[in-house]
């Protein structure tokens, strides 16, 4: 006769492991008992359980409540056992020793491999600001057994670097994603992808990129200079910029206070019916937590009685 078993049994942490051991005997042979032992190198054999043909299943106190026979129907030549709720410490070598009548004893070994699926974590790097050089956008860490694979899925251009730390029964892998921040990256997803044989599918953690920036400011509203004449209603200046975080706007007049009746509404400066006192240099000040920008324009209100043309100067400053 001969023993049939597996070289390696692989199970995910917390699952039940079936340790197979089947005696393929000749006609008339009987299995008297099947002894299971843990036989890791450098340590003596530690009995796990024993199946006795007459007195049933015996379990070592160290494995009390964790070793069972597979459910019926059972073949009397089958010495397989179930190890319930596999833990990482169960990983190792096991020996099945079968005592038969009248052929004697047979033994076989298998390796139990316990997969520990990773629980990945993603940590964003420091605040991203346009104008920075190569900067850490995020790091992703996953620990498991065996070592997990950590990669990145993104449309954003960047570089990755990985490092691994081996522990006694597992390995931690950390991958970093570096990029040169630009405003076009705002709102883009950066996804950490963790692969592992103990996972049914890859685990994904997504981080949305936020890049602080502030665009140059400009003022719109003076395109047609002939419209800026005494008595005109609804005249307005609009300050144009964009940023992250969204900027705030402030209007001032360089050559004095804002004239009475002029309304400030965020990025817009609204004028009452124009008079010559509305002529002057107006400054739009745009700012967010990252930076600030200024843009100034000169308004000349035309007197229709005069035949002179309106002059407009447009200056942008940072």
């Amino acid at each position: 006769g001969e023993l049939e078993t597996s070289d390696v049994v692989t199970v995910v942490l917390g699952q039940d492991a079936k340790l197979p051991c089947f005696y393929r005997g000749d006609s008339g042979e009987q299995v008297g008992q099947v002894a299971w032992a843990r036989v890791d190198a450098g340590e003596g054999a530690q009995e796990l359980a024993l199946l006795h043909s007459k007195y049933g299943l015996h379990v070592s106190p160290a494995y009390e409540g964790r070793v069972e026979q597979p459910p019926p129907p059972r073949n009397p030549l089958d010495g397989s056992v179930l190890l319930r709720n596999a833990v990482q410490a169960d990983e190792g070598e096991y020996e099945c020793r079968v005592s038969t009548f009248p052929a004697g004893s047979f033994q076989a070994r298998l390796r139990l491999r316990v997969l520990v699926p990773p629980l990945p974590s993603l940590n964003p790097g420091p605040a991203l600001e346009e104008g920075q050089g190569l900067t850490l956008a995020a790091s992703c860490t996953a620990e498991g057994s065996p070592a997990p694979s950590v990669t990145w899925d993104t449309e954003v251009k960047g570089t990755t670097s990985s490092r691994s730390f081996k522990h006694s029964r597992s390995a931690a892998v950390t991958s970093e994603f570096h990029l040169v921040p630009s405003r076009s990256m705002n709102g883009q997803p950066l996804t950490c992808v963790v692969s592992h044989p103990g996972l049914l599918q890859d685990q994904r953690i997504t981080h949305i990129l936020h890049v602080s920036f502030l665009a140059e400011a400009s003022v719109r509203g003076l395109e047609d200079q002939n419209l800026w004449h005494i008595g005109r209603e609804g005249a307005m200046l609009k300050c144009l910029s964009e940023g992250q975080p969204p900027p705030s706007y402030n209007w001032t007049r360089l050559d004095g206070p804002l004239p009475s009746g002029v309304r400030v509404d965020g990025d817009t400066l609204g004028f009452p019916p124009l008079t010559t006192e509305h002529s002057g240099i107006y400054v739009c000040h745009v700012s967010n937590e990252f930076s600030s920008r200024d843009s100034q324009v000169t308004v000349d209100v035309l007197d229709p009685q005069e035949d002179s043309g309106k002059q407009v100067d447009l200056v942008s400053a940072s």
């Epitope: 054999a45 007459k54 009248p102």
Partner: nanobody, 119 residues
Framework: EVQLVESGGGLVQPGGSLRLSCAAS????????MGWHRQAPGKQRELVAT???????NYADSVKGRFTISRDNGKNTLYLQMNSLRAEDTAAYYC?????????????WGQGTQVTVSS
């Protein structure tokens, strides 16, 4: 042949404890199984507990958590620590040594030791 001699029985009050011993001699194999059975007056013999050479155990439901079986392979001695004894544990306790024999197993029995639980 295998010879078994039990000791340690006696009279004990309910809730008390006793420790039985069984000394084995003769041709004991390396794959033997040892255990304790008991037989109360007018009842069939029942299995109490068995233990393998490697220390794996099997207990009857009625004694789980109260009785502990152990063995000293070097001395070929079997023990049964009995705690929280009840009146229904009153019986003759027999040591058994299970040895391979031909096409199966052969049970060798001791003469027994009496345990009486009474107030």
């Amino acid at each position: 042949e295998v010879q078994l001699v039990e000791s340690g029985g006696g009279l004990v009050q309910p809730g008390g404890s006793l420790r039985l011993s069984c000394a084995a001699s003769g041709s004991i194999s390396s794959i033997n199984l040892m255990g304790w059975h008991r037989q109360a007056p007018g009842k069939q013999r029942e299995l109490v507990a068995t233990i393998t050479r490697g220390g794996s155990t099997n207990y009857a439901d009625s004694v789980k958590g109260r009785f502990t079986i152990s063995r000293d392979n070097g001395k070929n001695t079997l023990y049964l620590q009995m705690n929280s004894l009840r009146a229904e544990d009153t019986a003759a306790y027999y040591c058994v040594d299970v040895e391979p024999s031909g096409m199966g197993w052969r049970d060798y029995w001791g003469q027994g030791t009496q345990v009486t639980v009474s107030s």
